[in-house]
C-alpha cells in the first residue's frame, strides 16, 4: 500500500509509547558517600525502576534526546544542626554533558531548615522537592547533589528519591 | 490492505492519546474525616476531574496498568501546635493492592513546621508537595494520608490537592 | 487504501508527539516588577524554552486545548523580614480566561518562612514548589504571583522558574 516504512514506524512507535522513557530511583543506605560526589540511588529494588533511561554512578543517562520532566525529593532532618553547619542547605539537579567541562545547574533550592531547632538541640524535619522540564541529548546525565548531605535522612526509599520521564 | 486490526488499534490509540489517564482532585470540607482514614477529595466540582482513572473513598484507582506520575500537595497551618516545636507532620502517598494486606508507602515527607511561627504571633503556614513515578496495575489504588491531619488547612481546593497522570 | 485522511493525520500526530506542548521559563532580573502584576520570565536564554506554548507578559498561553501539568518554584530568602510583612507568603498559579473578568486561582501555597531565621543569624532561605494538572482552552493563560515578592530571590534561572507540559 506504499505506506510500508511509515507503517512499521507507527506500529513501533505505538508500542514504544508504553516505553516512553521514565525512571524513579530511590534513596538507600549507600546514597550518601561523603565524598563530595552526587547522591547514589537504588535502581532496581522496591519502587525503583529504569525504563528507557540508563544509570551510572548516581546519574540518570538519556538514551533518547528530548525534553524530560526531572524531579527529586530529599528528606532532611536532624537533632539540632551539626556544629559549623552553614545556615543553608542546597539541593539541586545538575547536568553533565560532554559539551562542558563542569556540571550545569538545572534546578536548585536553598533552605534554612534548622531554624529555631538550634537552641534546645531539638529534633526537626524538612523536605525539599524539585521538578522541572529540561532538554537532554543522548548520553547527557543528570545528578542530584545536597550540601550539607549530613542532613539527608534515608530510610526506605520513599522519603528521598530521583526520577524523570520524557514529556 | 491487511493492516485492518492494527489500523483500528492505531486510530483508537490516536483518539485515546487525548484520553491518557489523568486526574486532579481537590480538597473540600469533607476531606478531613478524623477517622484515621485517608483524606477524601472532590472529584467533579471546580478544578477537579477524572479522565481514565476512577475514585473510591479517597483513592485514585487505575483502570489501565502502567507508570503514573502521582502528586499531592497539602496546605498546613495553625495557631500553635499540639505538641509544640516537637510536632511532626507526615504527608504520604500510599498504594493499596490486592497483593498485600497493608498499604505500601510510595512517597513520604516529614516536616516540623511549627517552628515557623514568630515569637508572639502563633500563626504559621507551611506546604508539603510530593510527586513521583510509580507503577500501578489495574485496580490498584493510591491514597493520601496526613498525620497529624488537624494541621491541614482546606479552603477552596487550590491549596490541598491530589492528582496523577500516566507517563 | 481508503485510509488517506486518517493516515496523514496519524503521520502528523506521530511527528507532533515530539512537539507535545511544553515549556520551562526561568527567573531573571526583570522578573520582579514591583507593579503588583505577575512575575515575568525568561523564555529563550539558558534553560528556558517554549514548545507549542506561547508567552505574553508573564503568562504561558495555550495553543492547544487539553490538560496540562503546570508547575512553578520560587526561591524565597531574606535577612529578617521587611517591616510590616505579614507572616504569610502566598505563591500561586492563576488562570486568565476570556470567560471570566478576574484571574482564577489554580494552585496556591502559603508559607511562613521568616520563622526560619535563627535568633543570631537572621538570614533565611526557603523554597515553594507547586505543580498540578489543569485544563486549558486555546488562548487561556497561566501566570505566577508571589505576595510579598520582595522575598523572592533570583539568581541564574535555576532557583525560580515556571513551566508546563500537556499530559
Amino acid at each position: 500500500d506504499g505506506h510500508g516504512g511509515s507503517w512499521e514506524q507507527l506500529i513501533q512507535e505505538r508500542r514504544s509509547h508504553q516505553n516512553n522513557p521514565a525512571a524513579h530511583l530511590t534513596g538507600a543506605n549507600s546514597s550518601l558517600t561523603g565524598s563530595g560526589g552526587p547522591l547514589l540511588w537504588e535502581t532496581q529494588l522496591g519502587l525503583a525502576f529504569l525504563r528507557g533511561l540508563d544509570y551510572h554512578d548516581g546519574a540518570l543517562v538519556a538514551n533518547k534526546a528530548g525534553y524530560y520532566y526531572i524531579y527529586s525529593k530529599v528528606q532532611l532532618g536532624g537533632v539540632g544542626c551539626p556544629l559549623g553547619l552553614a545556615s543553608t542547605i542546597t539541593h539541586g539537579l545538575y547536568k553533565r554533558t560532554p559539551r562542558y567541562p563542569e556540571e550545569l545547574e538545572l534546578l536548585v533550592s536553598q533552605q534554612s531548615p534548622c531554624g529555631r531547632a538550634t537552641s534546645n538541640s531539638r529534633v526537626w524535619w524538612d523536605s525539599s522537592f524539585l521538578g522541572g522540564v529540561v532538554h537532554l541529548e543522548v548520553g547527557e546525565e543528570v545528578v542530584v547533589r545536597v550540601l550539607d548531605e549530613r542532613l539527608v535522612r534515608l530510610r526506605d526509599g520513599t522519603r528521598s528519591y530521583f526520577g524523570a520521564f520524557m514529556v | 490492505d491487511g493492516h485492518g486490526g492494527s489500523w483500528e488499534q492505531l486510530i483508537q490509540e490516536r483518539r485515546s492519546h487525548q484520553n491518557n489517564p489523568a486526574a486532579h482532585l481537590t480538597g473540600a470540607n469533607s476531606s478531613l474525616t478524623g477517622s484515621g482514614g485517608p483524606l477524601l477529595w472532590e472529584t467533579q466540582l471546580g478544578l477537579a476531574f477524572l479522565r481514565g482513572l476512577d475514585y473510591h473513598d479517597g483513592a485514585l484507582v487505575a483502570n489501565k496498568a502502567g507508570y503514573y506520575y502521582i502528586y499531592s500537595k497539602v496546605q498546613l497551618g495553625g495557631v500553635g501546635c499540639p505538641l509544640g516545636l516537637a510536632s511532626t507532620i507526615t504527608h504520604g502517598l500510599y498504594k493499596r493492592t490486592p497483593r498485600y494486606p497493608e498499604e505500601l508507602e510510595l512517597l513520604v515527607s516529614q516536616q516540623s513546621p511549627c517552628g515557623r511561627a514568630t515569637s508572639n504571633s502563633r500563626v504559621w503556614w507551611d506546604s508539603s508537595f510530593l510527586g513521583g513515578v510509580v507503577h500501578l496495575e489495574v485496580g490498584e489504588e493510591v491514597v493520601v494520608r496526613v498525620l497529624d491531619e488537624r494541621l491541614v488547612r482546606l479552603r477552596d481546593g487550590t491549596r490541598s490537592y491530589f492528582g496523577a497522570f500516566m507517563v | 487504501d481508503g485510509h488517506g485522511g486518517s493516515w496523514e493525520q496519524l503521520i502528523q500526530e506521530r511527528r507532533s508527539h515530539q512537539n507535545n506542548p511544553a515549556a520551562h521559563l526561568t527567573g531573571a532580573n526583570s522578573s520582579l516588577t514591583g507593579s503588583g502584576g505577575p512575575l515575568l520570565w525568561e523564555t529563550q536564554l539558558g534553560l528556558a524554552f517554549l514548545r507549542g506554548l506561547d508567552y505574553h507578559d508573564g503568562a504561558l498561553v495555550a495553543n492547544k486545548a487539553g490538560y496540562y501539568y503546570i508547575y512553578s518554584k520560587v526561591q524565597l530568602g531574606g535577612v529578617g523580614c521587611p517591616l510590616g510583612l505579614a507572616s504569610t507568603i502566598t505563591h500561586g498559579l492563576y488562570k486568565r480566561t476570556p470567560r471570566y473578568p478576574e484571574e482564577l486561582e489554580l494552585l496556591v501555597s502559603q508559607q511562613s518562612p521568616c520563622g526560619r531565621a535563627t535568633s543570631n543569624s537572621r538570614v533565611w532561605w526557603d523554597s515553594s514548589f507547586l505543580g498540578g494538572v489543569v485544563h486549558l482552552e486555546v488562548g487561556e493563560e497561566v501566570v505566577v504571583r508571589v505576595l510579598d515578592e520582595r522575598l523572592v530571590r533570583l539568581r541564574d534561572g535555576t532557583r525560580s522558574y515556571f513551566g508546563a507540559f500537556m499530559v
Epitope: - | 516537637a86 502563633r122 500563626v123 | -
Partner: antibody
Framework: QVQLVQSGAEVKKPGASVKVSCKAS????????MNWVRKAPGQGLEWIGR????????NYNQKFMGRVTFTVDRSTSTVYMELSSLRSEDTAVYYC????????????WGQGTLVTVSS | EIVMTQSPATLSVSPGERATLSCKAS??????????MNWYQQKPGQAPRLLIY???NLESGIPARFSGSGSGTEFTLTISSLQSEDFAVYYC?????????FGQGTKVEIK
C-alpha cells in the same frame, strides 16, 4: 476519666519561692499541652504560660518571665510550676488547665491551689 | 498583647430569660476562617469550665442552651433560657497570640 489533681495550699513569705504540682490521669499525658492560669482575689483570670509534656518545651507570659519555671515528670504524669521572688500580688489560686484536642482551649482543669504570700 | 473587653460587667437576668454577653478583642483573633475565641464559666470556689471553643463550637457535655457567635473582634455568648445553675462569672479568652488573655468577666446574677 480525665483528672488533674493539684497540690495543697501554700503560705509563703515575700521573696520566697513556691512549687505547685499537677498530676494528670485518664488520658495520654504527652499528647496534651498543660497551661497554667491564676486568679487573684477580685481579679480576672490570667494566663501564666504552657508546657508541652512530650518535649518539656515551654512558653511563658512575658509578665512572668524570669520568675516562673515549668517542668515535667513524664514517669509520674506530673507537671510543676515554680514561681520565685514572690510578692503579695502573687496571692492567687493557681490552676493547671489541659489543652484540648484542638489545643487552643483548656478543656479540663485542676481544682486549684491557693498560694498566699504574706509577711 | 490583645486586650479583651467584656460587657456588661454584671448582667441581672431572671431564670428562663435569655442572656447575651459581649466580648470585644483589641485586634482580630481570626485565622483562616476560624476564630480563636473561647468562653468559660466559673462559679465561686470552683475551677473554670470550658463552654465554647473556636467562637461557636459547643464543648462536649455542655447544654445546648449555650451558644457562641461572632468573628474578627466581636463575639457573643448567648444563654437561651437561664437555669439556676447558670448563675456564675463568664470569661472570654483569645488564643491566637501569646500571651493568651481573658476578659475581665461578666457576672450573671439572679434578677
Amino acid at each position: 476519666q480525665v483528672q488533674l489533681v493539684q497540690s495543697g495550699a501554700e503560705v509563703k513569705k515575700p521573696g520566697a519561692s513556691v512549687k505547685v504540682s499537677c498530676k494528670a490521669s485518664g488520658y495520654t499525658f504527652i499528647d496534651h499541652i498543660m497551661n497554667w492560669v491564676r486568679k487573684a482575689p477580685g481579679q480576672g483570670l490570667e494566663w501564666i504560660g504552657r508546657i508541652y509534656p512530650v518535649s518539656g518545651e515551654t512558653n511563658y507570659n512575658q509578665k512572668f518571665m524570669g520568675r516562673v519555671t515549668f517542668t515535667v515528670d513524664r514517669s509520674t504524669s506530673t507537671v510543676y510550676m515554680e514561681l520565685s521572688s514572690l510578692r503579695s500580688e502573687d496571692t492567687a489560686v493557681y490552676y493547671c488547665g489541659r489543652g484540648s484536642y484542638y489545643w487552643n482551649a483548656m478543656d479540663y482543669w485542676g481544682q486549684g491551689t491557693l498560694v498566699t504570700v504574706s509577711s | 498583647e490583645i486586650v479583651m473587653t467584656q460587657s456588661p460587667a454584671t448582667l441581672s437576668v431572671s431564670p428562663g430569660e435569655r442572656a447575651t454577653l459581649s466580648c470585644k478583642a483589641s485586634q482580630s483573633v481570626d485565622f483562616d476562617g476560624e476564630s480563636y475565641m473561647n468562653w468559660y464559666q466559673q462559679k465561686p470556689g470552683q475551677a473554670p469550665r470550658l463552654l465554647i471553643y473556636s467562637a461557636s463550637n459547643l464543648e462536649s457535655g455542655i447544654p445546648a442552651r449555650f451558644s457562641g457567635s461572632g468573628s474578627g473582634t466581636e463575639f457573643t455568648l448567648t444563654i437561651s433560657s437561664l437555669q439556676s445553675e447558670d448563675f456564675a462569672v463568664y470569661y472570654c479568652q483569645q488564643s491566637i497570640e501569646d500571651p493568651w488573655t481573658f476578659g475581665q468577666g461578666t457576672k450573671v446574677e439572679i434578677k
